[in-house]
Structure formats: structure tokens, C-alpha cells
């Protein structure tokens, strides 16, 4: 059964709701470790940008896993990095990301905490349209461990429309996760962090080149969905997870049969959150249109465990907790394609706040 995020508002429900649709049994008050990285003051204004990465690393115990370090010293035993360029980055040293790319210190960064009561219902946000995502086994696709995530490179022909005249083509997809006992999604909802998150990265058809689009409003669009535990195995994800052992080493790349990419996303493409942010890793380019689906994707406990323990990253450390702390909204509004706010009225709120990719 599809599970939605909006069930987290009000009283948490357990098991099946009266509608027969599972709702998330999530405490409204988040635990300390999953608290929003930037608590907004009551007047609705975002605070000055304060990086709470130290607090985040303390609460996650990251000091035991990957010590923050300057990018130029982060290669460990992997050989020399000559030249003065700051090119290495790690999740243990996100405070140093602006040295790698100044855009990482920008005001409109991702990920963010989606606070349901502050979302603006926007009727103009239509269901997404995906075309050509059901790939055949041939040609095969590249699956790689780049030291930061597992990435599936997608072939030409996967088309997506955010709305009329806003067409994109899929470039790649990748995942973010935690450990067996700590969730690792990038976005959070009311401070709640999910076990994992999938990102499908798209390039606007207005640009022929990725680097033309970087930093341009609407140049890139990412579809994001939360992965959540359920009793049943997800057969679509098994087509990826079954190959992780083959790319356990950092830098590994293999070819796997093509698969139905749409099956990796929720079935309900009509209920989602929308905001403008950035890439969540260096170069942290802004102008990225984010679509975060309300419905979660279900994986078995074994599958989530496989995701979190199969890959290795730099310096012979497990590739885990590969998520960036949530970033301040700094005045941005998160729009919802459905009335997600707890006190939402039948009338659309902030209907004029709806933006169009490229505005």
C-alpha cells in the first residue's frame, strides 16, 4: 500500500488508517538527532545562515567514521594530489565544501527540511509526466561506486515534464543512505529523516550541455523519493541492489541490464513538494528544481541493510551516512501539489507564489 508523508501531521497513526492506506507512525516532535538543522523563528523569517554541521556530526557520531579534513588532505593512502586545487571532498568535512566550490556557501542550498505546516498548496502543480523510463534489458547501463554514492548512468531518451514547456531528460540516478541503525535521507519532513533517498537527476532540454545548465534557474531538475522499510522485497530495487557486491570497491564500474526506472519511483506522481535549491554535493550549483514525492518507496529491511553495508569509500571506510545536513530556507517557500499543511483550507494558499522553472 502506498504510504504518504502527510500522515505525519497531527496525531501519529499506527498501522492501517481507516482508508486502508498506511500512514507513517512518526512523532511530530523530531528526535534531537533528526531535528531540522535550522529552526525557523516564529515570525516565519529564516534565521541568518548558521552552519550546524558541528552539531550534526556530533549527534551522528561522524567523528568516529570520517574525520573532517581539508579537501587537499583527504586522499588518505590513495596517492598524491598535486596542484593547489581543492578537489577532494567528503561528508565528514562539509564545512570545507565552500573551499571546493564557493556555491556550497550559497543562500539557496539543498537539501531542506520540509515543514508541512509551512508548505504552500499550489493548484498549478500538475502530475509529472515520465516518458521512456521503462528501459529494456539491452542496452546495458553503467552502475558505479564513485566513492560518494552508487550511480546508475541513464541513456538518452528518458523524458520528463515538470509542466507545459518544461521538458527535461534524465542523466543519472543515485542514492543516499545511512547505516543499519541510523537513517540517511537527505531531505527531512517535519524533522524526520527516512532510511534512504533516491535522486533522479535531469537536464533541461533548453540546454545541450550539462555545464551550460549548472547554476541556471531550472537548468537541472531532480526527482526525489524517500525509501522506507516494509515487509516485502522491492523487485525493481533488487535489480540494482543485487549488483552492489560487484562494485563494493571505490571506483568500480559494471554494466547491468536496463530496467524500469519509473518502478524505482513512487506510483503516485501527482502529490509532491516543489522548491528551488541546489545540487547536494559539490559544486552545489543552485537553480535546481526539486520535486520530492509525498509517497514513499518501500524496500525490505534486508534490502535497506544491503544498501547500507555493501559499498566501500575512501580510506577503506564503509560508504555510509552519505547525506548532507539540511540547509536553511532563507525565505524560500516549499510548494505542495496537494494540501499538505495541517491547517490547510479548501482554498489554495499562496497560489501566486507558484514559480515556473526558469523564472
Amino acid at each position: 500500500q502506498p504510504q504518504g508523508l502527510s500522515g505525519m501531521q497531527g496525531e501519529p497513526s499506527l498501522g492501517d488508517s481507516s482508508s486502508g492506506e498506511d500512514e507513517l507512525g512518526v512523532d511530530v516532535l523530531p528526535s534531537e538527532e533528526d531535528a531540522p538543522e535550522e529552526a525557523d523563528p516564529p515570525d516565519g523569517e529564516d534565521p541568518p545562515e548558521v552552519n550546524s554541521e558541528d552539531r550534526m556530526e556530533e549527534s551522528l557520531g561522524l567523528e568516529d567514521l570520517s574525520t573532517p579534513e581539508a579537501p587537499e588532505h583527504s586522499q588518505g593512502s590513495h596517492g598524491d594530489e598535486k596542484g593547489g586545487g581543492h578537489s577532494h571532498w567528503s561528508y565528514g568535512g562539509t564545512l570545507l565544501w565552500p573551499q571546493v566550490s564557493p556555491a556550497c556557501a550559497g543562500r539557496f542550498q539543498s537539501p531542506v527540511d520540509i515543514r508541512l505546516e509551512r508548505t504552500a498548496f499550489c493548484r498549478t502543480l500538475q502530475p509529472l509526466e515520465l516518458l521512456g523510463y521503462e528501459l529494456q534489458p539491452l542496452p546495458e547501463l553503467s552502475l558505479s561506486n564513485n566513492g560518494h554514492t552508487v550511480q546508475l548512468t541513464l541513456p538518452p531518451g528518458l523524458k520528463m515534464a515538470l509542466g507545459p514547456g518544461q521538458e527535461y531528460r534524465a542523466l543519472q540516478l543515485h542514492l543516499h543512505w545511512g547505516t543499519s541503525d541510523h537513517p540517511g535521507s537527505e531531505h527531512t519532513v517535519n524533522g524526520h529523516r527516512f532510511p534512504a533517498e533516491i535522486h533522479v537527476v535531469h537536464l533541461s532540454t533548453a540546454f545541450s550541455e550539462l555545464h551550460e545548465a549548472l547554476g541556471r534557474p531550472g537548468g537541472l531538475a531532480v526527482l526525489a523519493a524517500f525509501l522506507q522499510e516494509s515487509p516485502e522485497e522491492n523487485s525493481a530495487y533488487e535489480q540494482l541492489l543485487s549488483h552492489l557486491e560487484e562494485i563494493s570497491e571505490e571506483g568500480s564500474k559494471i554494466e547491468i541490464p536496463g530496467l524500469d526506472v519509473s518502478a524505482l519511483l513512487p506510483s503516485d506522481l501527482s502529490r509532491y513538494y516543489r522548491y528551488e535549491g541546489s545540487l547536494t554535493t559539490p559544486p552545489c550549483s543552485q537553480g535546481v528544481i526539486w520535486t520530492v514525492f509525498n509517497e514513499t518507496v518501500k524496500l525490505s529491511a534486508k534490502q535497506l541493510h544491503t544498501l547500507s553495508v555493501s559499498l566501500w569509500g575512501p580510506r577503506d571506510s564503509r560508504l555510509q551516512l552519505n547525506f548532507r545536513a539540511t540547509q536553511p530556507l532563507n525565505g524560500r517557500t516549499i510548494e505542495a501539489s496537494f494540501p499538505a499543511a495541517e491547517d490547510s483550507s479548501p482554498e489554495p494558499v499562496h497560489v501566486n507564489s507558484c514559480f515556473t522553472a526558469g523564472d
Epitope: 583527504s74 586522499q75 588518505g76 590513495h78 596517492g79 594530489e81 586545487g85 581543492h86 578537489s87 577532494h88 571532498w89 567528503s90 571546493v100 566550490s101 553503467s142 558505479s144 564513485n146 566513492g147 560518494h148 550511480q151 548512468t153 542523466l171 543519472q172 537527476v201 537536464l203 550539462l210 555545464h211 551550460e212 549548472l214 547554476g215 571505490e250 571506483g251 554535493t281 559539490p282 559544486p283 550549483s285 569509500g313 575512501p314
Partner: nanobody, 117 residues
Amino acid sequence: QVQLQESGGGLVQPGGSRRLSCAASGNSVNIFSFAAVAWYRQAPGKQRELVAVITTTGGTKYSDSVKGRFTISRDSAKNTVLLQMNSLKPEDTAVYYCNADYLQDYWGQGTQVTVSS
């Protein structure tokens, strides 16, 4: 437009050395700072083969056939990735291609390396 350009190929005797260079041009962002960069090779009548990879963390990986003889490194300041090839063998003869993988794949045109006496 991002362009990758390989250089350094040529004729070399068995047991000799050669250094290949891959330079990126035309991009607003230093692609080698954010991309996993690999060298591939393709011998006549054979499939393209992954030779060496360097990730953005500085991690390196080599195919079994070149381990201990080839070294991949990155010079982000000069926006180049190097492949130092030592103890070359006739079976290393191939066209060598540079590949940068950041959100999308970028390929160079290739440079021919011939190992022959």
C-alpha cells in the same frame, strides 16, 4: 562545450614508459574536481576496457592487467588527469580514451599507443 583531449600517445618499445595526459576545456566548472575520471583502452577487434579510475576522493582503481605498472593521477590546478605507463608490453597497444563521469559522461577522441620493437 566540455571537451576532453588526450595526448602523449605514440610508438614505444617494450619495457618502455609513456605518459598520457587528458585535458578538459570549455567548461565553466572544473570538471575534474567533481568527476570520477577514467582511462579506457580499445585494441583492434576488442571491446573497450577500463584501465584505471581516479575518484573525487582521490581513490584509484586499476584493471588487473595494468596493476603495478600504470599510475593514474589528477592535477586539478591544471585541469588534467595523467596516466603514467611503465613496463609497457605489446598487449598494451590500443587507442586510449579519457572519460569523465559527472552527471553525464564525457569522452575524448582517443590517442594511439603502440608498443612494438
